[in-house]
């Protein structure tokens, strides 16, 4: 019995993208179950690099080196077949990272987007990478791959993500590779968190003692909702980073977070969003904007408005 039915399935845990020095578990799964399997690395010679070694259930490969990058297949043990082995599995590409300098990853128009919108993730480098790979944290499937376009000493690729839905929110990294070693990837770009807003009802935002305060007076912004949000995110126009706080249940059955801003020096426009622990990159609709004004302060100019940056670990749980 050869062909599709007899084909085992080769998978990698936790991911097919493995850092140099890291470990990866290769599992050869068969619908009838395999106790034993053989692994093959598909170099041009198609010679099993594992010298006929037989593995049980899974094989932990590592610490990996660039030489481990490449395409793997497995064959499962079938005692009653003529050869004793199944047909070869699906090909599985293992990519080893950390072999070149990291590229940069940017989001256009920005990392904070409404549900249904499309975002362009641009991976670029002054290393002339032939290919760029985009990988979402926590996803075991192969990264997306694009050919780099070279202009003015920069190689770049634009990955289009969308229309955005909750499953696409999360932490992205990109990598580059050169032609002769397509699966020996660069170090990862800095992580970029893609946040989707507009999925849940908006919280309300208020200021204590009020939205107009004297210079030097302490200000606290309160974000609250009837929805049982776990985390609130506060952003200010013109500021790169959002702030986060755990929501606290109140006696009036609302869930609230109080953001102490300290002594007031400048005014600004604030918004807050709510999110749940299970989906930290999926946020509510924005609260109505709250303009905080500071009186008695001659210097109330602000930098030009920018989207809140989401490079600061938004998509990791708040412990």
């Amino acid at each position: 019995l050869m062909g599709g039915q007899d084909k085992p399935f080769l998978s990698a845990r936790p991911s097919t993208v493995v850092p140099r020095g890291g470990h990866v578990a290769l599992q050869c799964h068969y619908r009838r179950g395999f106790n034993n399997f053989m692994l093959y690395k598909e170099d041009r010679s198609h010679v099993p690099i594992f010298h006929g070694r037989i593995f049980q259930e899974s094989f932990i490969m590592g610490p990996v080196t660039p030489a481990h990058a490449g395409t793997y297949r497995c064959r499962g043990s079938r005692p009653h077949s003529l050869t004793g082995w199944s047909a070869p599995s699906n090909p599985l590409v293992i990519m080893v990272t950390g072999n070149h300098r990291k590229p940069s990853l940017l989001a256009h128009p920005g990392p904070l987007l409404k549900s249904g919108e499309t975002v362009i993730l641009q991976c670029w480098s002054d290393v002339m990478f032939e290919h760029f790979f985009l990988h979402k944290e926590g996803i075991s499937k192969d990264p997306s791959r694009l050919v780099g376009q070279i202009h003015d000493g920069v190689s770049k690729a634009n990955f289009s993500i969308g229309p955005l839905m909750p499953v696409l929110a999360g932490t992205y990294r990109c990598y580059g590779s050169v032609p002769h070693s397509p699966y020996q990837l660069s170090a990862p770009s800095d992580p970029l968190d893609i946040v989707i807003t507009g999925l849940y009802e908006k919280p309300s935002l208020s200021a204590q003692p009020g939205p107009t305060v004297q210079a030097g007076e302490n200000v606290t912004l309160s974000c609250s909702s009837w929805s049982s949000y776990d985390i609130y995110h506060l952003s200010r126009e013109g500021e790169a980073h959002e702030r986060r706080l755990r929501a606290v249940p109140k006696v009036n059955r609302t869930f609230q977070a109080d953001f102490p801003l300290g002594p007031a020096t400048h005014g600004g426009t604030y918004r807050c969003f709510g999110s749940f622990r299970a989906l930290p990159c999926v946020w509510s609709n924005s609260s109505d904007p709250l303009l905080v004004s500071v009186t008695g302060n001659p210097s109330s100019s602000w930098p030009s408005p920018t989207e809140p940056s989401s490079k600061s670990g938004i998509c990791r749980h708040l412990h």
Epitope: R44, P66, N99, H100, R101, V127, M128, E130, P179, H180
Partner: antibody, heavy 115, light 107 residues
Framework: QIQLVQSGPELKNPGETVKISCKAS????????MNWVKQAPGKGLKWMGW????????TYADDFKGRFAFSLETSASTAYLQINNLKNEDTATYFC????????WGQGTLVTVST | DIKMTQSPSSMYASLGERVTITCKAS??????LSWFQLKPGKSPKTLIY???RLVDGVPSRFSGSGSGQDFSLTISSLECEDMGIYYC?????????FGGGTTLEIK
């Protein structure tokens, strides 16, 4: 602009060691691998291997395994080719060239091995 | 190893003439092919990469074409300074391999 400047010509006896340098300027040294290419007198070009300037890992073509060694001095943006136990057949011009498609080349270093 | 067969090994051409040099790979190398010009006592000069991309500063009379296994370098109108030895290189797979070279001389 990008430049690769190699050390000067060498006259050596068989059995001796030679070390050729290739100093890079005009770009970030660790961005591009450095290749080494041999041209024997009256012969064509032969790729010897490359060194990953980011990780320091060398890769040698089969004919250049054993007596040949690539190394780096990253702080000085310099790559080196060392040939040990020189033989007459090592008489050649050696070039360094950077990047995956050998975009820029040094001027070459002539190594003459002769008694 | 991938074998690169370059032809012709030498040729004479007149000024203003259109010249084509070919390179054949023993297996598919995608478009990972470069062309170089060598002149005595000078650094090799990279003309083309990725089969058809002209390196900055190289005159537009040079062009490259092909993919897979068959490639060519064309000089649309030969000039005196174009004499030299031309080599192709595959960089799809390690070890990189050069063609045997084509010596181009002026008639």
């Amino acid at each position: 602009q990008i430049q690769l400047v190699q050390s000067g010509p060498e006259l050596k006896n068989p059995g001796e060691t030679v070390k050729i340098s290739c100093k890079a300027s005009g770009y970030i040294f660790t961005n591009y691998g450095m290749n080494w290419v041999k041209q024997a007198p009256g012969k064509g070009l032969k790729w010897m291997g490359w060194i990953n300037t980011y990780t320091g890992e060398p890769t040698y073509a089969d004919d250049f395994k054993g007596r040949f060694a690539f190394s780096l001095e990253t702080s000085a943006s310099t790559a080196y080719l060392q040939i040990n136990n020189l033989k007459n057949e090592d008489t050649a011009t050696y070039f360094c060239a950077h990047g995956p498609w050998l975009a820029y080349w040094g001027q070459g270093t002539l190594v003459t091995v002769s008694t | 190893d991938i074998k690169m067969t370059q032809s012709p090994s030498s040729m004479y051409a007149s000024l203003g003439e259109r010249v084509t040099i070919t390179c054949k790979a023993s297996q598919d190398i995608n478009s990972y092919l470069s062309w170089f010009q060598l002149k005595p006592g000078k650094s090799p000069k990279t003309l083309i990469y990725r089969a058809n991309r002209l390196v900055d500063g190289v005159p537009s009379r040079f062009s490259g074409s092909g993919s897979g296994q068959d490639f060519s370098l064309t000089i649309s109108s030969l000039e005196c300074e174009d004499m030299g030895i031309y080599y192709c290189l595959q960089y799809d797979e390690l070890p990189y391999t050069f063609g045997g070279g084509t010596t181009l001389e002026i008639k």
